[in-house]
Interface confidence: medium
């Protein structure tokens, strides 16, 4: 049935899917607060531009009776059920914010003829790449893959003089939603990462990982895993690690590394942490108090989704253009808008660009230090610390294959 969009005559509505199954276990109240905070700013921006219009959000809740796993496993049907609810109510906003699970986003995109934009805080998987009306406001797996390939190939930095072409990937199936799809992308045999590497093996058991740490016959010195330091400690403990092992710990949505009083534990000395630049982290705002750093990023993505809609609405209204058109639905990409804590850039496919930061543990200070940054928008690495105080020999990252000479 044809669903009418509440999106004209000076009244513009945002449909926010409040799904029980979510990329991060965040109380829906916090997401509501984030959306309401965003609405307040959008109204101010539109008013400042002389646009006397009404912008509101409608929160669509699922009944939670059937799809109650709380994680993303049963999100596919929940997303479609919510769309059915919208269809039955014959009421849809100008834009759909949510869902965050890759499964639900993929299925909703596939099963609906959407003539409106969909904004997601999540949907990390490769299956959500290159969707014409989907915008993703948290770094998707594709961005991680491009960084890793870029870093593997780099061989002209004072601290990295070897190109790498091998890796182990640790993936045991208990990962969070973001990590699950990041590692899934690295594992996929048809992905860019797999295509560019000569050797890649997935370690699925704790024992496999632990054995590699001291195995003289290992095929690579590099192990990629995803999670926080505590996750690594549970796995690695205080076991001895061969001196040329490098663990890459992907922990994008965690800015605890940048807090002043944080000391890196000893087990992190062989580890490079890949995280996002903290930017203007949100402290004590209505939707982020009492949140973990990860959840703060999730709530912020919801808020920025509202600001993005406001940005596009302003442009279209100022140009006298209709909002309920395919042109509007396809416009949420290749742009920069003013996010809550600074400019947010979206690439040609509507995916957020960001600055990734690679950290190492200084053997002198036991602090996390920035080794390099990587701009996902231009696919370029920028060294920061030209003489890092590494644990590795000669303060250089080792070759990825033991015993192999200079490349």
């Amino acid at each position: 049935s044809q669903v009418s969009q509440n999106c004209h005559n000076g009244s513009y509505e945002i449909s926010v899917l409040m799904m029980g199954n979510s990329a991060f276990a965040e109380p829906l109240k916090n997401l509501e607060d984030a959306v309401n905070e965003g609405l307040e700013i959008v109204r101010g921006r539109l008013q400042n531009a002389g646009l006397n219009v009404t912008v509101n959000a409608t929160f669509m809740y699922s009944d939670g009776l059937i799809h109650n796993s709380g994680d993303c496993r049963s999100s596919t049907c929940e997303g479609l059920d919510l769309l059915r609810k919208i269809s039955n109510a014959q009421r849809m906003g100008c834009v759909l914010i949510g869902p965050s699970c890759t499964y639900s986003t993929f299925q909703m995109y596939l099963d609906t003829e959407l003539s409106y934009p969909m904004i997601s805080a999540g949907s990390f998987g490769l299956s959500c790449d290159y969707k014409e009306t989907l915008t993703r406001l948290m770094s998707p797996a594709r961005k991680l893959m491009y960084f890793l390939v870029n870093f593997w190939k780099t061989n002209d930095l004072p601290f990295k003089t070897y190109s790498w072409s091998t890796s182990y990937v640790y993936k045991n199936g208990t990962e969070t939603e973001d990590c699950f799809w990041y590692l899934n992308a690295l594992e996929a045999s048809v992905s860019y990462f797999s295509h560019e590497l000569g050797f890649k093996v997935v370690l699925r058991q704790d024992k496999e990982f632990q054995d590699i740490l001291m195995d003289h016959n290992r095929k690579s010195n590099v192990i990629i895993m995803c999670g926080g330091p505590e996750f690594l400690y549970k796995l690695k403990g205080d076991r001895a690690v061969a001196e040329d092992i490098v663990i890459i710990l992907v922990d994008l949505f965690n800015d605890q590394y940048f807090e002043d009083n944080v000391t890196a534990p000893d087990y992190m000395k062989n580890v490079l942490v890949l995280t996002l630049s903290p930017g203007n982290s949100l402290l004590n705002s209505s939707f982020s108090r009492n949140l973990s750093p990860t959840k703060r990023d999730f709530a912020l993505a919801y808020l920025n989704g509202i600001l993005l809609f406001g940005h596009m609405l302003k442009i279209f209204l100022e140009n006298g253009e209709n909002i309920t058109t395919p042109k509007f639905a396809h416009a949420f990409r290749n742009l920069t808008f003013e996010g809550y804590d600074g400019p947010v850039t979206l690439d040609d496919w509507g995916d957020v660009d960001s600055t990734m930061v690679l950290l190492y543990t200084s053997v002198d200070t036991k602090k996390y230090k920035v080794l390099l940054t990587y701009d996902t928008h231009v696919n370029k690495t920028y060294p920061v610390d030209m003489s890092p105080t590494f644990t590795w020999k000669n303060s250089k990252l080792p070759n990825d294959i033991t015993g192999r000479g200079p490349q």
Epitope: D33, G44, N280, L283, N284, S285, R289, D341
Partner: nanobody, 115 residues
Framework: QVQLVESGGGLVQPGGSLRLSCTAS????????MSWVRQAPGKGLEWVAK????????YYVDSVKGRFTISRDNAKNSLYLQMNSLRAEDTAVYYC????????WGQGTAVTVSS
Amino acid sequence: QVQLVESGGGLVQPGGSLRLSCTASGFTFSRYWMSWVRQAPGKGLEWVAKIRHDGGEKYYVDSVKGRFTISRDNAKNSLYLQMNSLRAEDTAVYYCATDYTRDVWGQGTAVTVSS
């Protein structure tokens, strides 16, 4: 820990002016949006004005537009509210906050507009 100290309130006649100040500590002030919030006697909290971390955006409740100006000095960790053409209905305790529903509050500064 986060601390906010408001000052500058007082008794003023209708049509008069006051400048409120708020000094912040315990967090990186220059990274966050800041707000002024007020509570009139016997009433609930009302958001008054809001300013972006770099001062690039400012928003006001309709009732104070054109009369109040919010500003900040990140080098001094300070937030200001210049209040002109004051009216009796502006009488309230004024608080600064990083957000109007947040948990940490200063003691506020009382503004009384009366002849």
